[in-house]
């Protein structure tokens, strides 16, 4: 059997025998275009493709539509993998989405969606989610049904004013909705009563800005 040299996601890399967490090169489905991603090969059985990470405020997440499309930041630290790659990948087969959260008091929680995909750019990378489980709230903090993605220069929300400008960051804003993991990063003791922080309402409430977040995906049949 010929050795696989290109990989669509971290699950394929894991199955090929590369089981160390780190940065790997992924290839777009049906293309030779490449993208660098962080693969978590330890958590929950491994094979997770990290599509978002916040941990220290080192990267500015108030970015343009194009930047959210192609990705930005550093896969070894804070980054956004890119809506176009995630859209193409999650329309190839069924993926699960796991969102791992940390607060400033040492607590951790997660939300796991058993089916996740993003629509195409023509449909504003609308998020589609089904089947929530986990410890970060019994109700989804990503509004259901899913919303279109919005950025500071691409306003697709349901608010009378622009959520991305007000709350900062690109996200699937509703009006503006119970979450924004791409909001402003606030350090400890400055992280409460924040209008525009890193928010996951059904775990920590409206004004609490989180310490760390990771969004990761993996094929449902892994």
């Amino acid at each position: 059997k010929e050795e696989q040299t290109t990989f669509r996601d971290c699950a394929e890399i894991f199955k090929s025998g590369l089981t160390t967490s780190g940065i790997y090169t992924l290839t777009f489905p049906n293309s030779t275009e490449e993208i660098k991603a962080y693969c978590d090969m330890e958590a929950g059985g491994g094979g997770w493709t990290i599509i978002q990470r916040r941990e220290d405020g080192s990267v500015d997440f108030q970015r343009t539509w194009k930047e959210y499309k192609v990705g930005f930041g550093n896969p070894s630290g804070e980054y956004w993998l890119g809506n176009e790659f995630v859209s193409q990948l999650t329309n190839q087969q069924r993926y699960v989405l796991k969102i791992h959260l940390k607060d400033w008091e040492g607590n951790e929680a997660y939300s796991l969606y058993e089916h996740f995909y993003l629509s195409s750019e023509e449909l504003n990378y609308r998020i589609h989610l089904k089947g929530l489980t986990g410890t970060a709230g019994k109700i989804s903090s990503i509004s259901q049904p899913g919303n279109d993605f919005s950025t500071k220069d691409g306003d697709n929300d349901k608010c009378i004013c622009k959520c991305s400008q007000m709350l900062t960051g690109g996200w699937w804003f509703d009006a503006c909705g119970p979450s924004n993991l791409n909001g402003m990063y606030y350090p400890q003791r400055q992280n409460t009563n924040k209008f525009n922080g890193i928010k996951w309402y059904y775990w920590k409430g409206s004004g609490y800005s989180l310490k760390a977040t990771t969004m990761m995906i993996r094929p449902a049949d892994f």
Partner: antibody
Framework: QVQLVESGGGVVQPGRSLRLSCAAS????????MHWGRQAPGKGLEWVAV????????YYVDSVKGRFTISRDNSKNTLYLQMNSLRAEDTAVYYC????????????????WGQGTLVTVSS | EIVLTQSPGTLSLSPGERATLSCRAS???????LAWYQQKPGQAPRLLIC???SWATGIPDRFSGSGSGTDFTLTISRLEPEDFAVYYC?????????FGQGTRLEIK
């Protein structure tokens, strides 16, 4: 469409009480913090009170603290303002208003506003 | 509390002219958390601008907001007859929420 309709205003003597209501429709009431504001005749706008979407948090302007109580009944999509120990300076048109952003409570812009209900405190 | 001072108190202009309304804060408004409202006689206020410069849905683009820190401006590029009203600024940067005293825009 989003609609807010206030009721309960009227003429009342100083020291007496009045309860205002605001019936909300056209949006998910439970997702939004709600406010009361007021406008004395011929004067400007003044913020009075806010209640969070879940009813757990309430804040008031200093001039009404201890006299006014904001509350809500999410099962009835209704906001209330209980006004006790009324004074002549409380005479105003009282407006209820929805916060501009859902799942947030406190500091926000307002949209929309109701049409207002007039409260006159006079002996 | 943050005190907002609007100027001028009254502005007399003709349709077609440009109107510039000022709102000055007693201390810096973080995050440009400032809104503008229009109020006509016997009506409730109507949101025009939030976040200092973002148009509310359905507001004509002849209205524009600008500014940061302590100085904010509402500009109406070309006055229409329906624009003559009272305009209020409001800050939601710190508690309590406060409004300016208003600017009356009247027909000259």
């Amino acid at each position: 469409q989003v609609q807010l309709v206030e009721s309960g205003g009227g003429v009342v003597q100083p020291g007496r009480s009045l309860r205002l209501s605001c019936a909300a429709s056209g949006f998910t009431f439970t997702n939004y913090g709600m406010h009361w504001g007021r406008q004395a005749p011929g004067k400007g706008l003044e913020w009075v009170a806010v209640i969070s979407h879940d009813g757990n948090n309430k804040y008031y302007v200093d001039s009404v603290k201890g006299r006014f109580t904001i509350s809500r009944d999410n099962s009835k999509n209704t906001l209330y303002l209980q006004m006790n120990s009324l004074r002549a300076e409380d005479t105003a048109v009282y407006y209820c208003a929805r916060e501009g952003i859902d799942f947030w409570s406190g500091l926000n812009w307002f949209d929309p506003w109701g049409q207002g209900t007039l409260v006159t405190v006079s002996s | 509390e943050i005190v907002l001072t609007q100027s001028p108190g009254t502005l007399s202009l003709s349709p077609g002219e440009r109107a510039t309304l000022s709102c000055r804060a007693s201390q810096s408004i973080t995050g440009s958390y400032l809104a503008w409202y229009q109020q006509k006689p016997g009506q409730a206020p109507r949101l025009l601008i939030c976040g200092a410069s973002s148009w509310a849905t359905g507001i004509p683009d002849r209205f524009s907001g600008s500014g940061s820190g302590t100085d904010f401006t509402l500009t109406i590029s070309r006055l229409e007859p329906e624009d003559f009203a009272v305009y209020y600024c409001q800050q939601y940067s710190s508690s309590p929420i406060t409004f300016g005293q208003g600017t009356r825009l009247e027909i000259k």
